[in-house]
Interface confidence: medium
Amino acid sequence: FKVATPYSLYVCPEGQNVTLTCRLLGPVDKGHDVTFYKTWYRSSRGEVQTCSERRPIRNLTFQDLHLHHGGHQAANTSHDLAQRHGLESASDHHGNFSITMRNLTLLDSGLYCCLVVEIRHHHSEHRVHGAMELQVQTGKDAPSNCVVYPSSSQDSENITAA
């Protein structure tokens, strides 16, 4: 399977909410013994590999933001910790998963990575990630709402295994 990032750039005004999205593509094993671990983290554009570095999002680690569920299940982070930081990650039945960030500040600007790991019998089988940029703007040049820029087909399809 692959991970697609429908949008490679999100430009948002300060104080706005934004939902960053990734999508699971390709054949997904839905066997009873297969689960999916999905999470989000901040990173930087490494010279060798994007998303190799894992940094917290608003002080929450990728472990705090993870979803871990069977292939046929939807899931979301309902725990207070994430919500107290204005964050919620979610996943639906169709392979979409997202992180919603509320009340954006300039400090939220940066590179965000989604990670999906296919797990069979508690062991990591395949892992892929996607990357997208968030720019939070303030002042007269800031848009009134979030503006999203679609990934090129090459960007969204050509995702490297983590």
Partner: antibody
Framework: QVQLVQSGAEVKKPGASVKVSCKAS????????IHWVRQAPGQGLEWMGY????????EYNQKFKDRVTMTRDTSTSTVYMELSSLRSEDTAVYYC????????????????WGQGTLVTVSS | DIVMTQSPLSLPVTPGEPASISCRSS???????????LEWYLQKPGQSPQLLIY???NRFSGVPDRFSGSGSGTDFTLKISRVEAEDVGVYYC?????????FGQGTKLEIK
Amino acid sequence: QVQLVQSGAEVKKPGASVKVSCKASGYTFTHYTIHWVRQAPGQGLEWMGYIIPSSGYSEYNQKFKDRVTMTRDTSTSTVYMELSSLRSEDTAVYYCARGAYDDYYDYYAMDYWGQGTLVTVSS
Amino acid sequence: DIVMTQSPLSLPVTPGEPASISCRSSQTIVHSNGNTYLEWYLQKPGQSPQLLIYKVSNRFSGVPDRFSGSGSGTDFTLKISRVEAEDVGVYYCFQASHVPWTFGQGTKLEIK
């Protein structure tokens, strides 16, 4: 420090069910899986299965599949293991253990264990 | 199911001397992802098991460096370079590569 505290000893009659609890503390409950392992008197260890506390997904050793149910209560950081249709061969100490894994959720060991719960099945 | 066979089943050792426990699996325990999930646990008398070694040769934090693990495929070994009195108990190997995960029958280490 990481602690797994299990419920007290139980005596059950054949055909009954038993529900053993395992309360976790000292770490973030939803970051780790919980496994169950049993040990019959004077015997070795036997892996029964595990549960993912964040989602409730569980996977069982086929030997116990029809009789075991693992559940969790995230509000109290507690995992439960229920074994039904008990028989004398189920007399054992039941242990819960935390499943540790790397950054890609790849299991590598059961790193912390509860103190064990003795379940005696006798008529 | 994969059968894990340990030898010897009983191991009397003089303090300060080395000890070695063998564990053989009935088929390879190299997982499809390339890792080998072979662990060693020690159960001291009257206590719960405790983790010593994971993924064949990695010592768990706090485990003395006199304990080491090695092996590949189907043959694995736990070595104690100098046995101490506190090392007594039953040692179990455990494979977590193929469900159901299985333990060896245990090796009882005792002080001579």
